[in-house]
């Protein structure tokens, strides 16, 4: 007996061919001998089966001796043996219908688990193999689970169900809800405007939720909430903002925050959380601010940085177009009795300059000028 696999919700076509290449009488029945459909002359007739409104044939093939049974919007319970009676002979086709669904929602937060459940007809023993968008293969029986979803798991999962040496393929689109970056760092000179951006790694029609930015300044003993906001259909509205600093927030996505001035007392780390409507858990993005200040007090030229810097970062003071006078893996460097000229304070990582501040040292009878 021929075996045909179908997918829940899909359409399947079961073939029945007569030796005579012309339109003759045929009937399709199920295993209980209940008539599904057939013909009477050139008319399509339907029986009392539960498939009545979902069964059809392809009349255009009748003249060629082909009498297919089309079943639309397949259900698991349509799995059965179907019998085509034509020319005093019977052709049997076993139809097995499978369904594959994601546990709850196909939009999952980063770090959550994905469970795929296979619906299969009684008596079947299928095996399932799924391939994630990043090429990871998982195998299982009735359920497959993937814990700790990552951003790279977003996309189309291709799952193959194998039964009786035949296969049927399912494609499930999974969206992992996360920020594009888990962490970011902004380097600014004192007094400069600071832009923080929190782009999302997904797009959805409607996005509603609420968020907050907590900030732990390096100089402060505890963290504090800098801003809270609401998100409604991708429109951002500020609920509450601290007086110091007075952050500004963009009204549209991506989430965008502006700090009017980078000051040493603001240097530190922040955690932006976003709680999405109808989702348990929150999205997180860490943001860091490093602030640099170069000053000259009497005979001392000082360069300082505040904020979360890695121990391998190098802080240097150098006279323009000259070798560095001082370079240290520390957060402050200074030069006593600096020569007159344009001095540069550089924060660098393996030779790559991350932040630079210039200060003009005038001959000793003048006062210093900061450009």
């Amino acid at each position: 007996k021929k075996v045909v696999l179908g997918k829940k919700g899909d359409t399947v076509e079961l073939t029945c061919t007569a030796s005579q290449k012309k339109s003759i009488q045929f009937h399709w029945k199920n295993s209980n001998q209940i008539k599904i459909l057939g013909n009477q002359g050139s008319f399509l007739t339907k029986g009392p089966s539960k498939l009545n409104d979902r069964a059809d044939s392809r009349r255009s093939l009748w003249d060629q001796g082909n009498f297919p049974l089309i079943i639309k919007n397949l259900k698991i319970e349509d799995s059965d043996t179907y019998i085509c009676e034509v020319e005093d002979q019977k052709e049997e086709v076993q139809l097995l219908v499978f369904g594959l669904t994601a546990n709850s929602d196909t939009h999952l937060l980063q770090g959550q688990s994905l469970t795929l459940t296979l619906e299969s007809p009684p008596g079947s023993s299928p095996s399932v193999q799924c391939r994630s968008p990043r090429g990871k293969n998982i195998q299982g029986g009735k359920t497959l689970s993937v814990s700790q979803l990552e951003l790279q798991d977003s996309g189309t999962w291709t799952c193959t169900v194998l039964q009786n040496q035949k296969k049927v393929e399912f494609k499930i689109d999974i969206v992992v809800l996360a920020f594009q970056k888990a962490s970011s760092i902004v380097y600014k000179k004192e007094g400069e405007q600071v832009e923080f951006s929190f782009p999302l790694a997904f797009t959805v029609e409607k996005l509603t939720g609420s968020g907050e930015l907590w900030w732990q300044a390096e100089r402060a003993s505890s963290s504090k909430s800098w801003i809270t906001f609401d998100l409604k259909n991708k429109e951002v509205s500020v609920k509450r903002v601290t007086q110091d600093p007075k952050l500004q927030m963009g009204k549209k996505l991506p989430l965008h925050l502006t700090l009017p001035q980078a000051l040493p007392q603001y240097a530190g780390s922040g955690n932006l959380t976003l709680a999405l409507e109808a989702k348990t858990g929150k999205l997180h993005q860490e943001v860091n601010l490093v602030v640099m200040r170069a000053t000259q007090l009497q005979k001392n030229l000082t360069c300082e940085v505040w904020g979360p810097t890695s121990p391998k970062l190098m802080l240097s003071l150098k006279l323009e177009n000259k070798e560095a006078k001082v370079s240290k893996r520390e957060k402050a460097v200074w030069v006593l009795n600096p020569e007159a000229g344009m001095w540069q304070c550089l924060l660098s990582d393996s030779g790559q300059v991350l932040l630079e501040s210039n200060i003009k040292v005038l001959p000793t009878w003048s006062t210093p000028v900061q450009p």
Epitope: V4, R59, S60, N66, V168, E169
Partner: antibody, heavy 120, light 106 residues
């Protein structure tokens, strides 16, 4: 999005064969019939035959029986139509088209067409 | 095979006109009739299936009617992009198409 992409134009000599491919994407390949329709220059549309990609079953219009062969490769979601014993009147644009979900034997998505020129 | 005859073979009309194309089957085909639009150098596009059902994405100015042997395609108010060739096709028996109706700008 759902699309059918066909192979490029061919020039053949009378008596030769031509094999045109039609690659499906954006839907479950095995669910819907693929049909072949041709159109001679300046003429109307002529239905050639069908394939059920799920079972591999095929059928063709009486005019083409014995000359047309349809095959499929489910691993690449591709259907092939081979026409043999070519004659000059087979010069045409050959289209593949798929059935819609709603009704059999209407053609809701078409390939871009493959021009086959038969000339000595 | 069932013969499908379209009339007229060609017609000229202006933007904004109401246009009707007819298709006659050589025997009764119930409502197993589809209509297509084809522009030069392009593949045909399904407009209407089952005689009167508008295909998804097709503008509502297109409509189809008829059953048995006589069918019509109506464009209520011609738009510049509607100038093309129109084909009817039956699927009651082995698929056959009408010879086409060329709709030109007057």
């Amino acid at each position: 999005q759902v699309q059918l992409v066909q192979s490029g134009a061919e020039v053949k000599k009378p008596g030769a064969s031509v094999k045109v491919s039609c690659k499906a994407s954006g839907y479950t390949f095995t669910t819907y019939y693929i049909h072949w329709v041709r159109q001679a220059p300046g003429q109307g549309l002529e239905w050639m035959g069908w394939m059920n990609p799920n079972t591999g079953d095929t059928g063709s219009a009486q005019k083409f029986q014995g000359r047309v062969t349809m095959t499929r490769d489910t691993s690449t979601s591709t259907v092939y139509m081979e026409l043999s014993s070519l004659r000059s009147e087979d010069t045409a644009v050959y289209y593949c088209a798929k059935d819609p979900a709603v009704t059999p034997d209407a053609f809701d998505i078409w390939g871009q067409g493959t021009m086959v020129t038969v000339s000595s | 095979d069932i013969q499908m005859t379209q009339s007229p073979s060609s017609l000229s009309a202006s933007v904004g006109d109401r246009v009707t194309i007819t298709c006659r089957a050589s025997q009764s085909i119930s409502t197993y009739l589809n209509w297509y639009q084809q522009k030069p150098g392009k593949a045909p596009k399904l407009l209407i299936y089952a005689a009167s059902t508008l295909q998804s994405g097709v503008p509502s100015r297109f409509s189809g009617s008829g059953s048995g042997t006589d069918f019509t395609l109506t464009i209520s108010s011609l738009q510049p992009e509607d100038f093309a060739t129109y084909y009817c096709q039956q699927s009651y028996r082995t698929v056959t198409f009408g010879q086409g109706t060329r709709l030109e700008i007057k």
